[in-house]
Interface confidence: medium
Amino acid sequence: RTVPPMVNVTCSEVSEGNITVTCRASSFYPRNITLTWRQDGVSLSHNTQQWGDVLPDGNGTYQTWVATRIRQGEEQRFTCYMEHSGNHGTHPVPSGKVLALQSQW
């Protein structure tokens, strides 16, 4: 069976002018997934991203996340790229108010 992931992109402020963008994939099966941030259409190098483990979410499916830190104002240059079971998609950083929350970094 294949269950496609639900992908959600959120932003949180870490310091003035800097934000962490987090891309979360959830409720997918099987567990193999590619999740990475792209800047200007190109995957970021590994040293500028942080990944969460792929974990069971209790429903027989899995969840994971990837985050990167960017400067406020350059959100439109970034997209989250997802590939799962032959399907792929890109998800933009939402425009609008940034959550003033502590990030996972």
Epitope: V14, D40, G41, V42, S43, S45, N47, T48, I70, R71
Partner: antibody, heavy 121, light 112 residues
């Protein structure tokens, strides 16, 4: 070995058009972003335009915006620069370069030999 | 746009002696991902430019280790520990932080 070969330069009158090509070999062209850089005779370097691997992200210098169009054909391993409404100040050697900064590598690590565009009446 | 400046614009050096080129940016090139997007290029006479240093202090592949890059967010230095005849040419710094990418005016290194 990586090779970038530009062509299409030449003499053109102000207001005219030219299409530059850059033939790439020795690497997986479709994986890499590309840029055009130019250099006026006896002057410094000026970045002109950028295109992402899939062609979905494109940027231009203000000096060429609305007149130049960057494009690529990944099946032909080729990069293009369509230059319209050319001006005397566009006279320069045009270089194509790879842009690999997101691959744990760096930008502009390979350059072509350049092609000369001369805009004069 | 980020403005890049360099000094000196001309640098006569005796072979075997050290050389230093300064570059400044009108805005910090330190990204929040902790990379500093400053590059150094050398254009030898009659040739295309070649990369020397990427992300401020990293030596590009095949570049002799007599070259080194250092700096902070807005002030950068390219050093050559012992200049050789083959080092002649024009050295450019470039910011790769945001569009449009911008170059410094160049520093011409020549042998005394």
């Amino acid at each position: 070995q990586v090779q970038l070969v530009e062509s299409g330069g030449g003499l053109v009158k102000p207001g005219g058009s030219l299409r530059l090509s850059c033939a790439a070999s020795g690497f997986t062209f479709s994986n890499y972003a590309m840029s055009w850089i130019r250099q006026a005779p006896g002057k410094g370097l000026e970045w002109v335009s950028y295109i992402s691997p899939g062609g979905d992200y494109i940027y231009y210098a203000d000096s060429v915006k609305g007149r130049f169009t960057i494009s690529r054909d990944n099946a032909k391993n080729s990069l293009y620069l369509q230059m319209n409404s050319l001006r005397a100040e566009d006279t320069a050697v045009y270089y194509c370069t790879t842009d690999r900064r997101h691959y744990g590598s760096y930008a502009m690590d390979y350059w072509g030999q350049g092609t000369l565009v001369t805009v004069s009446s | 746009d980020i403005v890049m400046t360099q000094s000196p614009l001309s640098l006569p050096v005796t072979p075997g002696e050290p050389a230093s080129i300064s570059c400044r940016s009108s805005k910090s090139l330190l990204h929040s991902n902790l990379n500093t997007y400053l590059y150094w290029f050398l254009q030898k006479p009659g040739q295309s430019p070649q990369i020397l240093i990427y992300r401020m202090s990293n030596l590009a592949s095949g570049v002799p280790d007599r070259f080194s890059g250092s700096g902070s967010g807005t002030a950068f230095t390219l050093k050559i520990s012992r200049v050789e005849a083959e080092d002649v040419g024009v050295y450019y710094c470039m910011q790769h932080l945001e569009y449009p990418f911008t170059f410094g005016p160049g520093t011409k290194l020549e042998i005394k």
